[in-house]
Interface confidence: low
């Protein structure tokens, strides 16, 4: 993790690259690795795309193990094939406005994003494209047989989406933040970002937190009970240790993670919070994250479509955040 | 529309200081950067520093003990300040927007005699 | 500190092409360079015209473009007018700070 030791270089005679991801020697000058990108996290052995104008951003000296590249002020931002230029704010499609800062893009939806549960009144909610309108909107299907009875639906609620309000105003500022972006891994330790003014100085910043939708080695839907078709928040058996790049929390944390759906369904976080989690790493340093604790994940058809950036990055945005 | 002006003297003496402002409109200090550049027959044009939107400052290895950037957000002004000044500082010095250095101000020419 | 070079002079026709190129004396020019260009009218009048190495500034014609080319960064003029007639500046970022080059004189010849 750190240049002390000798050089041991993995993958000889060099890691074979994604497109667009340039082969770099690593921070201590030993081994040839694929640099990260925008949003990954690096260490002194990962350095970040130089050829993107990326550093790592360890955020305080205290972390200066694992950080988060980031582009340098003012970088521009590529989004949807346009350049967008830092501070500049555009309108992506009638759903988002969104706003280049440092090559970070944050957007803020226009339309309404909550995720409806099931409930009395509407015990199958879809949501679908109403013709010359822009928003969708939810309708509800008539169940395909009429079985739900009485007792049965106090299981059903509406879940309220909490959240900083965007256009909340403090003195002399319009106070906007934009939704924490979906958890860059579908499993494992991943990376959400938003773009806020809530602070000090009213000055437009990113932020970044460490988030785990689920954990990879977990067989969840093996769990599934017998007749349904989802797990929406998985019981975690016993409370566990976050891995960080050779670091280890300090705690032990009973998390929750979101299931799995074998009926097309996804499962993604729908209440949030960002709390801090110390790390401690081999050569005893310790440093301190922000990371994403979910508290209700939602079991939904508006699962990420991989044509469509916008509904892969904000159906499975982070709802409701407590942080 | 982006608009960046400014307003210093244009004669000072040898070993006096330079103070320059630059009060921009139409955009944000907390959103765009601001440049100082100078130009002079001899030496083309010369980037002095920068504010960064953050307030964070990178300077001219050359200028950096003598030179001085600060900013106040909120009336939307830029201070540029240089000290020690000599005959060869004589140039004209212009503030810029960051961002492909799109806007500049309309320039302050300084010419440093006794 | 690093030296950028430009050519000192270009000519051209109205509607003619011509290719500005600006050179880094320690190495290529890459993205991370932050490439830009910049136009000067008469009366000291700068307009940025490129950024980002080829981001466009607002306003700015399309006739204008910006790019790498080998180990150099570079300003395409295509179908020049004879507005375009003007001294042109790149500047290349160093990690730390902007050096500018000597500037090219475009002549639209017309």
């Known amino acids: 993790q750190n240049c002390s030791g000798p050089c041991r270089c993995p993958d000889e005679p060099a890691p074979r690259c994604p497109a667009g991801v340039s082969l770099v020697l690593d921070g201590c000058g030993c081994c040839r690795v694929c640099a990260k990108q925008l949003g990954e996290l690096c260490t002194e052995r990962d350095p970040c795309d130089p050829h993107k104008g990326l550093f790592c951003d360890f955020g305080s000296p205290a972390n200066r193990k694992i950080g988060v590249c980031t582009a340098k002020d003012g970088a521009p931002c590529i989004f949807g094939g346009t350049v967008y230029r830092s501070g500049e704010s555009f309108q992506s499609s009638c759903k988002y406005q969104c706003t280049c800062l440092d090559g970070a893009v944050g957007c803020m939806p226009l339309c309404s994003m909550d995720v409806r549960l099931p409930s009395p009144d509407c015990p199958f909610p879809r949501r679908v494209k109403l013709p010359g309108k822009c928003c969708e909107e939810w309708v509800c299907d008539e169940p395909k047989d009429q079985t739900v009875v009485g007792p049965a639906l106090a299981a059903y609620r509406l879940e309220d989406t909490f959240g900083p309000d965007p256009t909340m105003i403090r003195a002399n500022c319009l106070v906007q933040t934009t939704e924490w972006s979906a958890c860059s891994k579908t499993c494992g330790m991943g990376i959400s970002t938003r773009v806020t003014n809530d602070n000090a100085s009213c000055r437009l910043e990113k932020q970044s937190r460490l988030c785990m939708v689920r954990p990879c080695e977990a067989d969840l839907e093996e769990n599934i009970k017998k007749g349904k078709k989802c797990i929406r928040t998985p019981k975690i058996s016993k409370p566990i240790k976050f891995e960080l790049s050779g670091c280890t929390s300090m705690k032990t944390y009973r998390a929750k993670f979101c299931g799995v759906c074998t009926d097309g369904r996804c499962c993604t976080p729908h209440r949030t919070t960002t709390l801090p989690v110390e790390f401690k790493c081999p050569d005893g340093e310790v440093m301190k994250k922000n990371m994403m604790f979910i508290k209700t994940c939602a079991c939904h058809y508006n699962c990420p479509g991989d044509n469509d950036i916008f509904e892969s990055l904000y159906y499975r945005k982070m709802y409701g955040d407590m942080a | 529309q982006v608009q960046l002006k400014q307003s210093g003297p244009g004669l000072v003496q040898p070993s006096q200081s330079l103070s320059i402002t630059c009060t921009v409109s139409?955009?944000?200090?907390?959103?765009?950067?601001v440049h100082w550049i100078r130009q002079s027959p001899g030496k083309g044009l010369e980037w002095l520093g920068v504010?960064?939107?953050?307030?964070?400052?990178d300077y001219n290895a050359a200028f950096m003990s003598r030179l001085s950037i600060t900013k106040d957000n909120s009336r939307s002004h830029v201070f540029f300040k240089m000290t020690s000044l000599q005959t060869d500082d004589s140039a004209i010095y212009y503030c810029a927007r960051d961002g492909g250095f799109d806007y500049w101000g309309q320039g302050t020419t300084l010419t440093v005699s006794s | 500190q690093a030296v950028v070079t430009q050519e000192s002079a270009l000519t051209t026709s109205p509607g003619g092409t011509v290719i500005l190129t600006c050179r880094s004396s320690i190495g290529a020019v890459t993205t991370s360079n932050y490439a830009n260009w910049v136009q000067e009218k008469p009366d000291h009048l700068f307009t940025g015209l490129i950024g980002g190495t080829s981001n466009r500034a607002p306003g700015v014609p399309v006739r204008f473009s910006g790019s790498l080319i080998g180990d150099k960064a570079a300003l395409t003029i295509t179908g020049a007018q004879a507005e375009d007639d003007a001294m042109y500046f790149c500047a290349l970022w160093y990690s730390t700070h902007y050096v500018f080059g000597g500037g090219t004189k475009v002549t639209v010849l017309g």
């Open positions: 139409g955009f944000s200090l907390t959103t765009f950067g």
């Open positions: 504010i960064w939107r953050r307030g964070g400052t």
